[in-house]
């Protein structure tokens, strides 16, 4: 069994969270990639997702939320800038493998965005200001509709749960995955 | 609770070769990026080098490339530093760190084991 | 590469004061960083990751801020056991992840 962990991201109104998802190269350079969005409750939902197959380096942008894959190094890096108190939630990057359930990665994201200035000058990063930095090509992907065979009856953890993992990757047994969704737009 | 413990440092000659091993337990090993970051006696933490969780990807400093090898056994949880033509400047304590799930710091790290070369 | 710069190299303050520890990066590296301490014979241990966060079990004196060069480790009121070494590390993207040279906190 392995333990399904969250690290935890204190940010301000306006900031950028910036993380990166590590993959095995070999089995999922190519495999298309989503940033996922957990509610209490809910079956976690596609905010983004890369194209299919994954083109490498290439940025993918849905509203304020960037995507870049690297396969050379087996990393997504998932960038959500301009962040608003509504962004605070469980977050999770997914490895589509159809026809297969999802491969979650490590670890769950707990994004906690609070209101006001970290106190510093020029800490405080606007929406222009993390667009400007993203290439002028990046691309919208439209996110498949899968739908797990199961259903989910209860909130996902907050925490922790035991679920068994091929590899370095979660295997998730219940979850959908919808077309993205503009919540972030 | 996670834990890290280096072992295999010890004095060898310029030119020489030494192997240090981690273990590590408390954590899904298999799921983590691991490291090995340096320190020279009375100086600052230096990065050698670290090893994706798969173990599909590796990352070298310049100052190790070529002659420093990092592998890692996921079935019994260790994590290897082959260290070749081994010089002075590479004396220092060498720390097993573990990286974060999200990204490329350092969240748990082993008390080190020392490597002295000199002749 | 990216070259970390941290001031000043020595700080001198008395327990309970407030200390400020800067860390400058060479180029912008958004809110990668992170902040670590160290104390004598002992290894490094994680105080502050993505610039902002503190690591699970570290006392709230502790708080980081700052974002794209400029960064800060404040400590509101320093303790006996916060008298160490600490050193800021960017990780931006692709290695070197690179350190700065470390600042010594010190009882004045």
């Known amino acids: 069994a392995t333990k399904l962990t969250e690290e935890k991201y204190e940010l301000k109104e306006g900031q950028t969270l910036d993380v990166k998802c590590d993959y095995t190269l070999e089995k999922f350079a190519s495999s298309q990639k989503a940033w996922q969005i957990i509610r209490d409750g809910e079956m976690p939902k596609t905010l983004a997702c890369t194209e299919r197959p994954s083109k490498n380096s290439h940025p993918v942008q849905v509203g304020r939320i960037i995507l870049e894959d690297y396969h050379d190094h087996g990393l997504l890096r998932v960038r959500m800038v301009n962040l608003q108190v509504e962004d605070s939630g469980l977050y999770q990057c997914v490895i589509y493998q159809p026809p297969k359930e999802p491969h979650m990665l490590f670890d769950r994201i707990r994004l906690v965005v609070t209101k006001g200035f970290s106190g510093t000058p020029g800490s405080n990063e606007n929406s222009t200001q993390n667009v400007y930095k993203i290439p002028p090509t990046t691309t919208k992907a439209l996110c498949p509709l899968y739908t797990s065979p199961r259903t989910v009856t209860q909130a996902p953890p907050k925490s922790t749960a035991d679920v068994s993992t091929p590899d370095s990757e979660i295997n998730l047994t219940n979850v959908t995955d919808i077309i993205r969704v503009p919540v972030f737009n | 609770e996670v834990q890290v413990l280096e072992s295999g440092g010890g004095l060898v000659q310029p030119g020489g070769s030494l192997r240090l091993s981690c273990a590590a337990s408390g954590f899904t090993f298999n799921a983590y990026a691991m490291s090995w970051v340096r320190q020279a006696p009375g100086k600052g933490l230096e990065w050698v080098s670290t090893?994706?969780?798969?173990?599909?990807?590796?990352y070298y400093a310049d100052s190790v490339k070529g002659r420093f090898t990092i592998s890692r056994d996921n079935s019994k949880n260790t994590l290897d530093l082959q260290m070749n033509s081994l010089r002075a400047a590479d004396t220092a304590v060498y720390y097993c760190?573990?990286?974060?799930?999200?990204?490329?710091?350092?969240?748990?790290w082993g008390q080190g084991t020392l490597v002295t070369v000199s002749s | 590469e990216i070259v970390m710069t941290q001031s000043p190299a020595t700080l001198s303050v008395s327990p309970g004061e407030r200390a400020t520890l800067s860390c400058r990066a060479s180029?912008?590296?958004?809110?990668?960083l992170a902040w670590y301490q160290q104390k004598p014979g002992q290894a490094p241990r994680l105080l502050i990751y993505?610039?902002?966060t503190r690591a699970t079990g570290i006392p709230d004196r502790f708080s980081g801020s700052g974002s794209g060069t400029e960064f800060t480790l404040t400590i509101s009121s320093l303790q006996s056991e916060d008298f160490a070494v600490y050193y800021c590390?960017?990780?931006?993207?692709?290695?070197?992840?690179?350190f700065g040279q470390g600042t010594k906190v010190e009882i004045k």
């Open positions: 993505g610039a902002y």
């Open positions: 180029q912008s590296i958004n809110s990668n």
């Open positions: 590390q960017e990780f931006i993207m692709w290695p070197p992840w690179t």
């Open positions: 090893i994706s969780g798969s173990g599909s990807t590796t």
């Open positions: 760190a573990k990286v974060a799930g999200s990204n490329f710091f350092f969240d748990h």
